[in-house]
Structure formats: structure tokens, C-alpha cells
């Protein structure tokens, strides 16, 4: 795990996009893949386990000369909490990867509260890059305009 971070809490939630599509995890050939699609009202939504971490941001790194703290998350399908959403900086994809002991930096995302209902996930290892939706897939999106809808997600308690 990342130096200096400490686990605050963890809780399950369903993850949906700004356009009300569900993020789900489907087992294909022994591996989980991530789908973004319309789910029926009666269809049970997949859940993710969100682990919330506090990460210090020393004045030397903060850019505004004062110590700060960031709230970060990593996410696992509730079906298998030993795999994590992972930011692949080679092809700007979002993957599920099985971990050994603790998640690598690529599995951590800085949480941004964008509005009353929506959050965004900024890659810890790629500042300025967010989990987004492209062609019904999760992908990494370099966000110039942070208010862009394709990086906004709703976390819902089941």
C-alpha cells in the first residue's frame, strides 16, 4: 500500500454513471471483466467494496504551502474482494487485478465530491486523470474540464 496512508473505513455501494448506467462485474473465462450498461429497474445491481484511506499531503507537495489531507479509495467487486480496480497507465484502461497482499499505487483513486450526488475518482499515480466512461467501458480520461459528465459516478447504498 501507499506510504503514510491509513484505512479510515470501508463500505459497500453500487456504482452507476451520470447517465444512470450500472457498473457491473462479469466472470468470463475465469476472469472478471467490467461492464457499463443499462440495468433494469428490478435487476439487482453489482456492488463494490470501497475502502477509504486518508493520505497526508505535506506542504512541500501541496502546491499551496500548507499541509493537507486527501481522501482516497480503492475498489473491489463485492463478489471477490481480493481483486482491485486498477489504473493501467500504458493503455489508459481500467482493469481488475488480483493482488498479493496490499494494493499497488495504481489501485488508489483520490475521491472528488463533484456535487450532492456525484463523485469522481482521480488516479493517484496519474494526477489529472480520472476513471471515466468511454464506449460503454471504464477507461482513464484526462480531464481538462472537470465538470465533464463522463467522469461522474453515483455511489448508492443498497
Amino acid at each position: 500500500s501507499i506510504q503514510g496512508t491509513s484505512l479510515l473505513t470501508q463500505s459497500p455501494a453500487s456504482l452507476s454513471t451520470y447517465n444512470d448506467q450500472s457498473v457491473s462485474f462479469v466472470l468470463e473465462n475465469g476472469c472478471y471483466v467490467i461492464n457499463v450498461d443499462d440495468s433494469g429497474k428490478d435487476q439487482e445491481q453489482d456492488q463494490v467494496l470501497l475502502r477509504y484511506y486518508e493520505s497526508p499531503c505535506p506542504a512541500s507537495q501541496s502546491g499551496d504551502g500548507v499541509d493537507g489531507k486527501k481522501l482516497m479509495v480503492n475498489m473491489s467487486p463485492i463478489k471477490d474482494t481480493d481483486i482491485w480496480l486498477h489504473a493501467n497507465d500504458k493503455d489508459y484502461s481500467v482493469e481488475l487485478q488480483r493482488g498479493d497482499v496490499s494494493p499497488p499505487e495504481q489501485a488508489f483513486f483520490v475521491l472528488h465530491k463533484k456535487s450532492s450526488d456525484f463523485v469522481s475518482f482521480e488516479c493517484k499515480n496519474l494526477p489529472g486523470t480520472y476513471i471515466g466512461v468511454k464506449d460503454n467501458q471504464l477507461a482513464l480520461v484526462e480531464e481538462k474540464d472537470e465538470s465533464c459528465n463522463n467522469i461522474m459516478f453515483k455511489l448508492s447504498k443498497i
Epitope: L8, T9, S11, Y52, E54, C57, S62, G63, D64, G65, V66, G68, K69, K70, L71, V110, L111, H112, K113, K114, S115, S116, V119, E122, E146, S147, K157
Partner: antibody, heavy 121, light 107 residues
């Protein structure tokens, strides 16, 4: 160090608009949300609204029809306007900064000293 | 809106006493709860965030516990400077509602 300072008229007439400014220093409005909270004399705290780090704004639905929050990043200022005020809006008005970058989940770590606004003719 | 109910609304205690204040949320808020201390004529001061985390510079006699809907602020050994009003606040959803406050007075 982190500072927030509320300013504005201490007396507003009924039906007029209350206007306050929160001037901040020691942190960036692009990283931290700034909230407005009020406290009527001898009573509890009421959250009014927030200007989030990304520039989006959320309001308390009980006040939404009358309240406007805006920012002037170049002046490091966040403004509050409350229209059609009545005596019930008499309160100490505070601005406060989020504990965490980019989110409010950690509460409000730094507060201004507050400014008393009295609504009276 | 999420309602936050604090109890008691006031209490009298002596220096050295252990003091417990409870806060009940009308729906689950995970651990997104903060506690503040306010003295007369002063701004609130953050004591506890994320239900259990001590804010910077806050003495270790203050502690927080709970998750979901039930939360507690404990002062293990009350000091003269602790006589004040204490508020809980949920940060799970807007509007970020406060409890009505608990006034801790000298017995």
C-alpha cells in the same frame, strides 16, 4: 496559515438581500470546498451551502430559493447572498473550509470568526 | 434530509468526570460524522472527523466511536476548558445537518 474572514453589513432591512464575503488565505479554492453555516442567537448550527473545489455548488434545500453562493478565485473570495430576508435570518454567519482536499467527508477543519447579521427595520 | 438527534441536550459534570454524548442519525451515514466544540462567542472547533479520528491538536482525552446510525463522543476526564457546547454533524449527504447540541456545564 489557514485563515477565513467573513465581512459584510451587520444590519439588513427586512425583504432586502443579505450579502457577505469570505476572504480566504493559506489555501487554494481549487483544492478545498468552502461552506457557509449560520447560527441564530442562542440556537444551533444550520448548514447553508458549499462551493466545492471543482466550482460546483450545493445548497440547503430549505434555503435554496433565496440563496446564491459564488466565487472570485482571483481575490480568494467566496460570496453569500440571501434574498428576501426576515427577522428569522438574524444569525452569526460563518464560512468554513473542508478538512479534506476535494471532499466534505471529513468535516470542516477551519472556520472564520463569524459575523453577526441582524435583520431589522 | 438526514436528521441528527443528540442526547442529552445538556449535562452537569465535574472536573475529572467521564462524559459521554450520543448522536443518532435518521439513516445510515457510514462513518461520515464529525464532532465540534463551541465556546460562547467563538467559532466551532473540529474535534473528531470520520467518527473516530482525532483532529490536529485535539487532546487524546476526546474520542469518538460508532458507525451507521449510532455515534458517541467521550471525554475521558473532563477538564475546566472542556465546558462548552458540543455538536455532531453528518457529512454523508447534503444538507450536512447538525445535531441540536449538548451543553456541558459545571456541576
Amino acid at each position: 496559515q489557514v485563515q477565513l474572514q467573513e465581512s459584510g453589513p451587520g444590519l439588513v432591512k427586512p425583504s432586502e438581500t443579505l450579502s457577505l464575503t469570505c476572504t480566504v488565505s493559506g489555501f487554494s479554492l481549487s483544492k478545498y470546498g468552502v461552506h457557509w453555516i449560520r447560527q441564530p442567537p442562542g440556537k444551533g448550527l444550520e448548514w447553508i451551502g458549499v462551493l466545492r473545489a471543482g466550482g460546483t455548488i450545493s445548497y440547503n434545500s430549505a434555503l435554496m430559493s433565496r440563496v446564491t453562493i459564488s466565487e472570485d478565485i482571483s481575490k480568494s473570495q467566496v460570496s453569500l447572498k440571501l434574498s428576501s430576508v426576515t427577522a428569522a435570518d438574524t444569525a452569526v454567519y460563518y464560512c468554513a473550509r473542508d478538512h479534506y482536499y476535494y471532499s466534505s467527508f471529513g468535516g470542516f477543519a477551519s472556520w472564520g470568526q463569524g459575523t453577526l447579521v441582524t435583520v431589522s427595520s | 434530509d438526514i436528521q441528527m438527534t443528540q442526547s442529552p441536550s445538556s449535562l452537569s459534570a465535574s472536573v475529572g468526570d467521564r462524559v459521554t454524548i450520543t448522536c443518532l442519525a435518521s439513516q445510515t451515514i457510514a462513518t461520515w460524522l464529525a464532532w465540534y466544540q463551541q465556546k460562547p462567542g467563538k467559532s466551532p472547533k473540529l474535534l473528531i472527523y470520520a467518527a473516530t479520528r482525532l483532529a490536529d491538536g485535539v487532546p487524546s482525552r476526546f474520542s469518538g466511536s460508532g458507525s451507521g446510525t449510532d455515534f458517541t463522543l467521550t471525554i475521558s476526564s473532563l477538564q475546566p476548558e472542556d465546558f462548552a457546547t458540543y455538536y455532531c454533524q453528518q457529512l454523508y449527504n447534503t444538507p450536512y445537518t447538525f445535531g441540536q447540541g449538548t451543553k456541558v456545564e459545571i456541576k
